[in-house]
């Protein structure tokens, strides 16, 4: 588990915002992925497939994605965050078969804004 | 998992710092405890008691921490995280026996500084 | 257990319109692509269209050329096939299937359409 | 559009019989590991029930009697030994690309 999340960068810098990466194994074809804030679904993307082969993306919650053969990656606003949140994806493999459902990595983010960045706030108009 | 995790803040601020906590249950008297970043032993804590009932406290990477009955808290200073790192309690059990060795909580961090500081921190001579 | 019930056919004369609708029970209808699948008298199986999980898209079969088409209401679990401009060759029996990620893994009994002056 | 085609296009058989029913796409239906091929049987008077997916993966509750094989264009159904009440008609089906096609059919007759 610490080798498989230790090599896995999570989260990353994305213009300003957090990316928040969901690995998955290539092989999966059809799925859902949702990206939990503690207890609460931020966002919930899902991919399948019709009976041409045509995919359909449905992202209800309309967050900002990237979906490659093999990760799903979330983009945030800096929210606050000061007392840190928990993130977890969680994934649903349709296909293939059996259904499947797992929880993924999982990891907290710190949104930290430095002592001497609060001082020079107060200096601000 | 989630649940678990989610009410357990691995992480918080303390001091312009990051404080981690390790919880471990209120039955266990005699103890290592181990964080890890990434694959690296970060700190590592142990507690022991004597014939006395004498209790001893080895602390052999000095890092700054707070023990109490039930938990083990290791102060960091904000390394560049940006790239975020995965950190890991490791619990070694001695008493009550019989010996156990658990990874305990785990959480990727990624200590994120906003934007607006950053642009202050350039105005700066 | 998953149930698919066809209703809406019977004779209509050539160039006329029809309605048909599919009810579905036993699964979360709104979870997945449903299609169409037709059958002529003594014939084999036709695939007629399909549509996606929010009916946001649709495909259809060539034979189609803009004269049918599939929506559905997932507050009411109904899947629809309107037919325009029929033809004699429109003559069928026209399944509600659910396609099942990876195979139409349920059918309904069929509504037989007949295209007759 | 992809063109399935199905023999024998009809076989009489008898209770016991080991029976091999053929499919041959137009193109290829290997996508990553998987083949994009089912079968179904369709009895008379009944709408068609699944039997096979991913050309060898058998669906819940067929039998084990059913085997489907092959890969790329060429694919088989097997019955390791024919029943009765196996009679009626068999498709194979395509889901490579829009449209999903479906062969010929194969019907199973008593001898």
């Known amino acids: 588990e610490l080798n498989d999340l230790a090599n896995h960068r999570m989260f990353s810098f994305h213009d300003g915002g957090v990316q928040i990466s969901c690995n998955y194994p290539e092989t999966v074809q059809q799925l859902k992925m949702q990206l939990f804030k503690d207890r609460e679904v931020l966002c919930d993307l899902t991919k399948t497939k019709g009976s041409g082969n045509t995919v359909s993306i449905k992202n209800p919650m309309s967050c900002p994605y990237q979906l490659s053969n093999n990760s799903v990656s979330f983009f945030l606003d800096n929210a606050d965050s000061s007392q840190g949140s928990y993130f977890l994806c969680s994934l649903s493999i349709f296909d293939p078969p059996p259904f499947q459902e797992k929880n993924l990595s999982g990891g907290y983010l710190l949104i930290y804004e430095s002592q001497l960045c609060c001082q020079l706030k107060l200096w601000l108009p | 998992e989630l649940n678990d995790l989610a009410n357990h803040r691995m992480f918080s601020f303390h001091d312009g710092g990051v404080q981690i906590s390790c919880n471990y249950p209120e039955t266990v008297q005699q103890l290592k405890m181990q964080l890890f970043k990434d694959r690296e032993v970060l700190c590592d804590l142990t507690k022991t008691k004597g014939s006395g009932n004498t209790v001893s406290i080895k602390n052999p990477m000095s890092c700054p921490y707070q023990l109490s009955n039930n938990s083990v808290s290791f102060f960091l200073d904000n390394a560049d995280s940006s790239q975020g790192s995965y950190f890991l309690c490791s619990l070694s059990i001695f008493d009550p026996p019989p010996f156990q060795e658990k990874n305990l909580s785990g959480g990727y961090l990624l200590i994120y500084e906003s934007q607006l500081c950053c642009q202050l921190k350039l105005w700066l001579p | 257990e998953v149930q698919l019930v066809e209703s809406g056919g019977g004779l209509v004369k050539p160039g006329g319109s029809l309605t048909l609708s599919c009810a579905a029970s036993g699964f979360t209808f709104s979870d997945y692509w449903m299609d169409w699948v037709r059958q002529g008298p003594g014939k084999g199986l036709e695939w007629v269209g399909n549509i996606d999980e929010d009916g946001s898209t649709t495909y259809y079969a060539p034979f189609v050329k803009g004269r049918f088409t599939i929506s559905r209401d997932n507050a009411k679990k109904t899947l629809y096939l309107q037919m325009n401009s029929v033809k004699s060759e429109d003559t069928a029996t026209y399944y509600c299937?659910?396609?099942?990620?990876?195979?139409?893994?349920?059918w309904g009994q069929g509504t037989l359409v007949t295209v007759s002056s | 559009d992809i063109v399935m085609t199905q023999s024998p296009s009809s076989l009489a058989v008898s209770p016991g019989d080991k029976v091999t029913i053929n499919c041959k796409s137009s193109?290829?239906?290997?996508?990553?590991?998987?083949?994009?091929l089912a079968w179904y049987q369709q009895k008379t008077g009944q709408a068609p029930k699944l039997l096979i997916f991913?050309?060898?993966t058998r669906h819940t509750g067929v039998p084990d009697r059913f085997m489907g094989s092959g890969s790329g264009t060429d694919f088989s159904l097997t019955i390791n030994s024919f029943q009765t009440e196996d009679l009626g008609d068999y498709y194979c089906q395509h889901h490579y690309s829009t449209p999903p096609t479906f062969g010929p059919g194969t019907k199973l007759e008593i001898k």
């Open positions: 193109q290829s239906l290997l996508s990553g590991n998987y083949n994009y």
């Open positions: 299937t659910r396609w099942g990620r990876y195979a139409f893994d349920s």
């Open positions: 991913y050309a060898s």
